[in-house]
Interface confidence: low
């Protein structure tokens, strides 16, 4: 007949499981419950996946692993009396008088409930890694944390190599015994202990549960250390950089922590498991019953089979590990779960030229000397596309790509961003907004939706802001509709006349050169270089200024670079930026200073692209540690990551304009990194590649 095989992880658990099986049988509960002995939760998950067992209750981190690695699904959740439905919240608490925010945690002193505990360690550390605030090299999370905070109390970290830093704030009991023990001997252990560590001024931030502050302040705590504490003297750190009252934990937390749940194989009927357990809890969850599902006292242990604090078991409607864990906890787990044993020893970087091979070789040597992990290996390819193919085929691991290549890498090869380049704020040539500039003209004002029949000025054929993005955007929005993939003809028919300088004018529609003026002698008209006065972004703006065109497609800085005295050439000397406006995608017009909100797209920074199964945090962790040593162009450590001048080339491995490698944060897909507008423009253009 049908039976459910529960997996027990210890002798006491096996004992309780046997009793539960007997009690269920006695009560006539079907199907039969059998017990299988595993050695650990991990082992049980393997037994379930191998169809040698059927069910086990797991905590959030184990549910993540079981779901991601073994395809198991949660079907029954625990509900706890004291908690918020099937979850509680992990929060970061600070003194109200301090100025700490989530963005300024580096260097502060931290208080944790215990090593590897959910709210005291896993969630905050995972969150800090996943959000890019904390970089981890070579899966050495302990080292990363010990370097990040300015001393901590992490009970249980005394056995680790980083106890000096991670136990620095711990104090043991009143006689100094048990310092940093993962037990009540350490006064700063557990939720109340971590909060005490903050309250007594040992630490600046405490990672605890949403209820911890309220349970230990305002006279609610018996021990003398908390008698005078007021909840209003503490605040929560929110993920957006703000702070909030300690009662605002629903809105201001690091993550919602899911309850423990029963997991089974994907082919197991979750309803059946719930019916079995529901029948059981109906009969065996109250005091005085012959068997108590939610008590482990009789076995001399805690939390056997289910947490003792469980008040009821409930069916899980959406039976996926992602839905049960929720995106906040899921993200934190992604940041935390890094297995050093499964970390590849090498990161194979894709290189495209002889100078790049030389620079990559030097980078590999420099990184190895500093014991950076994983080690770099250099693998050459013929083109960016060839790199993508080789990465997909697992022959290479990483490559830095530009916007259009990121699009192809993501869409065609399934690659994802692992780190990005960041350029100086004043550097507008590497990451910029594409804008449509018009004259401020109240009598003949038109909008982006009314461009048909207007005269247009473009930097040049194929230029990102002058051609690709604006034309792609107009195609995507349905204004320009090319026939038989003939974009040039479609654009020439859409605008009344244009200037789109080009290098190879064969079969080029004459109207795309109609507004061009050539050089001072009227020669070289429409050529794709500066001999054409309307060439480039400055030239396209000049085309608008001199009334040749009605709209110019340029970078967001073009107007500022050529007005208000910033360009002394005669055509620009007297221009005022306030005489120009931007056309916005929503049909409005805006001041030229509103480019961040009124643009056709943002040209994204370059990004390092990898396979989706690559741990992006180890890639960023490596680059972040490396840039501390080699990121400054004036460093004396023998290698310059963001400079190619020693190799007689430019933009090798990374763009030379890069000032830092940055984490991708929430932009974990190619679409997220590129932004919707830029993707839409590229899709508009790529829809015409027949």
């Amino acid at each position: 007949g049908m039976e459910v095989r529960w997996c027990a992880t210890s002798d006491p658990e096996q004992h309780k499981c046997g009793n539960m099986s007997e009690a269920f049988r006695e009560a006539g509960i079907q199907p039969s419950l059998l017990c299988v002995r595993g050695t650990s939760a991990d082992h049980c998950v393997q037994l379930i996946a191998a169809q040698e067992a059927d069910a086990i209750t797991l905590d959030g981190g184990a549910i993540y692993e079981a779901g991601k690695e073994h395809g198991l699904k949660p079907v029954v959740g625990e509900v706890y009396d004291q908690e918020v439905g099937t979850s509680y919240y992990a929060v970061a608490v600070v003194r109200r008088s301090s100025h700490v925010t989530i963005d300024t945690l580096k260097g502060v002193k931290s208080c944790h409930t215990g090593i590897n505990r959910t709210v005291g360690w896993n969630v905050p550390v995972g969150y800090l890694v996943e959000s890019g605030r904390l970089s981890v090299m070579g899966c050495d999370v302990l080292k990363a944390v010990s370097d990040y905070f300015g001393g901590s109390c992490v009970p249980g970290a005394g056995e680790t190599s980083y106890s000096e830093s991670l136990c620095r704030l711990c104090r043991g009991d009143s006689s100094g015994e048990g310092v940093c023990d993962k037990s009540p001997l350490e006064r700063y252990y557990d939720y109340s202990g971590a909060f005490r560590c903050l309250a007594e001024g040992a630490g600046d931030v405490a990672f605890v549960k949403h209820s911890t502050v309220l349970e230990n302040t305002d006279g609610k705590t018996l021990p003398s250390w908390g008698q005078a504490l007021l909840s209003q003297d503490f605040e929560l750190l929110c993920r957006d950089g703000s702070r909030a009252d300690v009662t605002e934990w629903r809105q201001c937390h690091l993550a919602r922590v899911p309850a423990h749940a029963v997991v089974v194989r994907a082919d197991t009927d979750g309803g059946l498991i719930f019916r079995l357990l529901n029948e059981g809890q109906r009969l065996f969850s109250h005091e005085g019953s012959s068997f108590q599902m939610f008590s482990s006292e009789a076995y001399g242990q805690k939390d056997l089979l289910f947490k003792d604090s469980t008040s009821e078991l409930v069916p899980i409607a959406t039976q996926t590990y992602e839905a049960w864990l929720g995106h906040e906890y899921l993200h934190a787990m992604k940041g935390l779960l890094c297995d050093p044993n499964r970390l590849p020893p090498y990161l194979r970087w894709c290189v495209l030229s002889t100078p790049e091979i030389q620079k990559c070789g030097d980078m590999a040597v420099a990184f190895r000397r500093q014991r950076l992990k994983p080690e770099i290996q250099c693998v050459s390819a013929k083109s960016p596309q060839h790199c993508m193919e080789r990465i997909q085929a697992e022959q290479v691991d990483a490559v830095t790509l530009s916007g259009e290549d990121i699009y192809t890498a993501g869409k065609t090869y399934g690659l994802v961003p692992a780190a990005g380049e960041h350029y100086a704020p004043e550097d507008s040539s590497n990451s910029y907004y594409v804008v449509a500039v018009v004259r401020r003209d109240s009598s003949h004002a038109f909008t982006l939706d009314e461009l048909r029949g207007k005269r247009s000025c473009h930097a040049g054929f194929g230029s990102p802001a002058g051609w690709d993005v604006p034309v792609g955007a107009l195609i995507q929005r349905g204004f320009i509709r090319p026939k038989d993939c003939d974009v040039l003809t479609a654009v020439s028919e859409f605008f009344n006349a244009s200037c789109v300088p080009v290098n190879n004018p064969k079969n080029y529609p004459s109207s795309l050169c109609a507004l061009c003026v050539g050089d001072e002698q009227g020669r070289n008209k429409c050529v794709g270089n500066s001999q054409e006065r309307y060439y480039g972004y400055r030239g396209a703006f000049r085309c608008l200024v001199e009334n040749a065109g009605d709209v110019a497609f340029v970078r967001h800085t073009t107007v500022f670079d050529n007005t208000n005295g910033h360009n002394s050439e005669p055509w620009a000397a007297e221009l005022r930026s306030e005489d120009y406006e931007l056309l916005c995608p929503n049909g409005a017009r805006a001041e030229v200073s509103q480019f961040a909100a009124c643009n056709l797209a943002q040209i994204p920074p370059h990004a390092v692209m990898v396979r989706p199964d690559t741990n992006i945090f180890t890639v960023y962790g490596l680059l972040d540690k490396a840039q501390d040593l080699f990121g400054d162009d004036h460093n004396k450590n023998g290698f310059k990551m963001f400079d190619s001048s020693n190799y007689h080339g430019q933009d090798l491995l990374f763009k030379d304009a890069t000032v830092r490698a940055v984490p991708v944060g929430e932009k974990t897909t190619y679409r997220g990194w590129l932004g919707l507008d830029y993707v839409a423009a590229l899709e508009g253009m790529s829809s015409q590649q027949c």
Epitope: G270, G271, E312
Partner: antibody, heavy 119, light 112 residues
């Protein structure tokens, strides 16, 4: 024991707004789903919408443009507003609870309050 | 919306008899998670509706075991093994597999 009690005017003029209150005792409206259902003359029942423990609302698409469900957790009450009523909205209005424990069946109902729409 | 059709409209019975009420759904009520969210309610005269059976066959707490639910897919049945006077009233089936939840038209159980 969980108890729900509806209150509000029994007569509403056409085109005006119908406003009802459901007072809950024996359970907190910060857990579960808190619903409004109405029963028309002739026994036809219609589910109108709910407000969840986290304050999220879901409405029957047939009423979406006219209905609003809100709550006051400090009073343990939740409310129904139905705009632009017509004679077709004449019905007995019930509030009810749904929880995971009964797979979102409505395990506890209020007594119901009769509302007539007439000028 | 998902239409729930109840038969009969009225069911005259003698006390102690067995009563059977049918409920048919316009589409299958099996959720993608494998569960079937079909429930039964009783509204006695002058009272609020009471939950009898949830998810096809689960009796709600306090409901006598003479009430039983069965069925699958689109066809469901509520049975009362021995009708007592306190069982009289209007019985409704309801589904919450699909959104929005919908109800059957009701079956009036009355004494012959």
């Amino acid at each position: 024991e969980v108890q729900l009690q509806e209150s509000g005017p029994s007569l509403v003029k056409p085109s005006q707004t119908l406003s009802l209150t459901c007072s809950v005792t024996g359970d907190s409206i910060t857990s579960g789903y808190w619903n409004w259902i109405r029963k028309f003359p002739g026994n036809k029942l219609e589910w109108m919408g709910y407000i969840s423990d986290s304050g999220i609302t879901y409405y029957n698409p047939s009423l979406k443009s006219r209905i609003s469900i809100t709550r006051d957790t400090s009073k343990n009450q939740y409310y129904l507003q139905l705009n632009f009523v017509t004679a077709e909205d004449t019905a007995t209005y019930n509030c009810a609870r749904r929880t995971l424990a009964t797979y979102y069946a409505m395990d506890y109902w209020g007594q119901g309050t009769s509302v007539t729409v007439s000028s | 919306d998902f239409v729930m059709t109840q038969t009969p409209l009225s069911l005259p019975v003698s006390l102690g008899d067995q009563a059977s009420i049918s409920c048919r759904a316009s589409q299958s009520l099996v959720h993608s998670n494998g569960n079937t969210y079909l429930h039964w309610y009783l509204q006695k005269p002058g009272q609020s509706p009471k939950l009898l059976i949830y998810r096809v066959s689960n009796r709600f707490s306090g409901v006598p075991d003479r009430f039983s639910g069965s069925g699958s897919g689109t066809d469901f049945t509520l049975k009362i093994s021995r009708v007592e006077a306190e069982d009289l009233g209007v019985y409704f089936c309801s589904q919450s597999t699909h959104v929005p939840p919908t109800f059957g038209g009701g079956t009036k159980l009355e004494i012959k």
